[in-house]
Structure formats: C-alpha cells, structure tokens
Amino acid sequence: MAVTACQGLGFVVSLIGIAGIIAATCMDQWSTQDLYNNPVTAVFNYQGLWRSCVRESSGFTECRGYFTLLGLPAMLQAVRALMIVGIVLGAIGLLVSIFALKCIRIGSMEDSAKANMTLTSGIMFIVSGLCAIAGVSVFANMLVTNFWMSTANMYTGMGGMVQTVQTRYTFGAALFVGWVAGGLTLIGGVMMCIACRGLAPEETNYKAVSYHASGHSVAYKPGGFKASTGFGSNTKNKKIYDGGARTEDEVQSYPSKHDYV
C-alpha cells in the first residue's frame, strides 16, 4: 500500500510541478520594472522569455514578441533551452509514469517492467526539475547583475543636462513559480525513485517449500527462483515468502539492483 501511495503521490506532485514549469515558461513576468526608489512612471514594463510587455496607467497593455533568434542574449537562449528541455523531459516522464502506475493494469506487464519505468520516470522528473531550477536561477542571476549595473549608472547623460533614466528590472512572479515548480518536480521524481525500490521484484533465498510429486516427499530448496513459480492451490501467482501468501503491497523490501539510485 505504501508503495502505491508513494508512487501515486510522486506522480501527482510531478504533474503539478511540470504544469508549473510550463506556466512559468509561458508567463510574461520573468522580470518586472523595479518600482522602489525609482521615478514614478505612468507605464509598467515587464518581460518574459518570449516577449516584453508594457502596461500603461490606463490599463492598456501592449506586448511585443522577440522576433529574432540571433539578436537575443545567449543567456536568454540558454534559459529558454533549459526550460524547454525541462518540459520535454517532464512530459515524457509523465507519459512513462502513467504506464508505470501500480493502480493501472496494462496487459500482463511484469512488476520488474513497472519498476524500471518508475525509476526512468523518476530520473526524468529529477532532471526536469533541475533544468527548471537551473533556468530560473540563471535568469535571476542575470537580473541581479543587470540591476546593480543599472543602479551604478542609473542616470546617464551628456554634461548632466539631458538625463536618461534607465529602467531597472527585478524578479517577476514567473521566477518564483519556476523555482517552486522545479522543486515539486524534483520531489516528485525522488518519490518515484523511492517507490521503485518497493516495486522491484526481490531476488532472495526463500524458505523451503514442499512439493509432493507422485507419492514421494522430496523437499526442494529453490535458490533465487522468481515468485511466479507457485504450484497447486497458489494459482494467482502470489509471491510466497515464509510459507505464506502476501499481497504485492505487503512485500518486505530486500536489497535489489534498483536500491542504489
């Protein structure tokens, strides 16, 4: 039960995180005009990864897309790339994790396959979350650098006669959405990896199980048999540990090849 809950929760958390990463990537408010200690303007400027916007005091808002690829700063391109990679990996991870969910039955998919898929999706979510966090952090660093540069020469002019007030930009809402979303995706990924451990079929030595063959009592000690080799009344292929049948969610965790992720 705990494994299913962990996997399900990991999926939901990752789903919310990836939705947040998509939202942050699409949002226009990555950087917003700094209103503190600045001349009061009748316009409010804000910028996203894809376009810049100006809201006038009347409420009229005008946005212009960045209709160039080569003319954009390399850092902005890098942030775009990181966010898109994060979304793509997250989307693939979601797709994989849907099929890996324990509560969903697809044909006769084995637990080992589900465990592998859970681990794969978990890793994808972790990388997706890291991409988003990295992208947002790179943009934030760029803003901080530009902020102090524009503060240093806030008023530039010729002979002090004609002044040009430089618009300073500070953190926009999208940065916080991105950080939180990246973190959620990361947490979701970790949860999926943890769930994978519980899903993994155990490779262990079982206690002796007696099989009665043609009147002779011969005890076989199968070393490392898979759990699906039961006979007689155990027709539902339940795992046999300690001579008793347990449901898949009650299986004890033993070290397996998926333990050290």
Partner: antibody, heavy 120, light 113 residues
Framework: EVQLMESGGGLVKPGGSLKLSCAAS????????IHWVRQAPEMGLEWIAY????????YYADTVKGRFTMSRDNAKNTLFLQMTSLRSEDTAMYYC?????????????WGQGTSVTVSS | DIVMTQSPSSLSVSAGEKVTMSCKSS????????????LAWYQQKPGQPPKLLIY???TRASGVPDRFTGSGSGTDFTLTISSVQAEDLAIYHC?????????FGAGTKLELK
C-alpha cells in the same frame, strides 16, 4: 458623445475649502482613469492629480499634495476634487480630463472647466 | 520633475505657411520597454479647453487633420503644421506622459501675421 462637465467652482477665501465635481457621460466611466489639470490666468497648463479606474492608484502634484483629495464614484459616473487650505496661487480654471485607453497616457477628452478664485 | 521647454514662445505666420515648433524634455521620454515615446501635443483655442492633437510623439488623435505632424524621439520633439489655416491659430502645449508628475510645456502661441 463623450462629455465631461465640471462644477463646484467659485470664490473662496485663503485657507478655505471647495469641492469640485466632474460628471461624465457618453462612455463607460469605470473603464478610464481621470486627471485634474488646472490653468492659472494667462499661464500654462498644470497637471494636479490622477485617479485610476478602480481608485487603486492616485497621484498628486507636489504643489497640492496633502491639501487636495481626489475620489470617484463609479456608480454615479462622478469624479471629485476636495480642495482644502486654499491659497491665492490655486486660483485657476480647473479641468477634468479623461486618460485615453490607448493614447500613450495622453488625455483624449477634456471638460469645459470650472473657475476657482482664491481671494480675500 | 521633468521640465518641458517649448520654443518659440510665439510664432507669427501667414495662412498657407509651414510652421514648426519645438519641445525639449529634461529626461528622455522614450520608454525602453516598448521603444515608444510618451509625448503628447495639445491645441488650445482662446476660451476653450485643450484638445488632443498628437500622442506617442507622432500618432494623430482621431479627427485631427493630416496637416499636423509630430516627430522626434528621446528628448527632442517637433510639431509641424504643413499649411496653416485660420482655425489653427491657438496655443500648442506639449506634455510628458511618461513620468509623474505629468508636466506641460509653457506653450507656443500661434498668431496671424
């Protein structure tokens, strides 16, 4: 037709108070920010205050800050300018003007004005 | 506050003449966010309220004849009347629409010669 009509002007003694009104018609009043602009006799135009459409933002010129209060009643399509501690330099024609929606913050329609005289 | 300086203070012209008046601001009225200039021109005839002529430095307001042209960017702006008509005799004000307080120039009075 867009119309703005100021009222409430008159003669007042220095230190006195006066409340100007601006009645709007011909447009959705609650969709626009409104300005008050004054013009002293034979002088240029002086912007004195602005109120956003929802009253969330109000700006004042330094010359009137603390003495004048701008407000609006969107239900009655009316704008107000409460003037206190009036001085002789407040003598002017007071206009209310609509902040245009897509006119780069310019004032696209003006009222005919109401005259305020501050004199002892 | 932004200081708006208009020149000349008055102009005497004959009907049909081309007229140019200037407006300079103490700070740039070009908004970096959208690369638009926030300057307006108003026409005020005697005994009347001002009327919006040009906004955004160069866009004519609705109903304004095309003989009125606004130009300039940053701190230097110009209003040109290609062929002055009798009804154009008025005071022309320029206004900063980017920074509060929104400031006006002292005006340029257009008179008939």
């Amino acid at each position: 037709e867009v119309q703005l009509m100021e009222s409430g002007g008159g003669l007042v003694k220095p230190g006195g108070s006066l409340k100007l009104s601006c009645a709007a018609s011909g447009f959705t009043f609650s969709d626009y920010g409104i300005h008050w602009v004054r013009q002293a006799p034979e002088m240029g135009l002086e912007w004195i205050a602005y109120i956003s459409r929802g009253s969330s933002t109000i700006y004042y010129a330094d010359t009137v800050k603390g003495r004048f209060t701008m407000s609006r009643d969107n239900a009655k399509n009316t704008l107000f300018l409460q003037m206190t501690s009036l001085r002789s330099e407040d003598t002017a024609m007071y206009y209310c003007a609509r902040g245009g929606y897509d006119t780069r913050n310019a004032m696209d329609y003006w009222g005919q004005g109401t005259s305020v005289t501050v004199s002892s | 506050d932004i200081v708006m300086t208009q020149s000349p203070s008055s102009l005497s012209v004959s009907a049909g003449e081309k007229v140019t008046m200037s407006c300079k601001s103490s700070q740039s009225l070009l908004n970096s966010g959208n690369q638009k200039n926030y300057l307006a021109w108003y026409q005020q005839k005697p005994g009347q309220p001002p009327k919006l002529l040009i906004y955004g430095a160069s866009t004519r307001a609705s109903g304004v004849p095309d003989r009125f042209t606004g130009s300039g960017s940053g701190t230097d702006f110009t209003l040109t009347i290609s062929s002055v008509q009798a009804e154009d005799l008025a005071i022309y004000h320029c206004q900063n629409d980017l920074y509060y307080p929104l400031t006006f120039g002292a005006g340029t009075k257009l008179e008939l010669k």
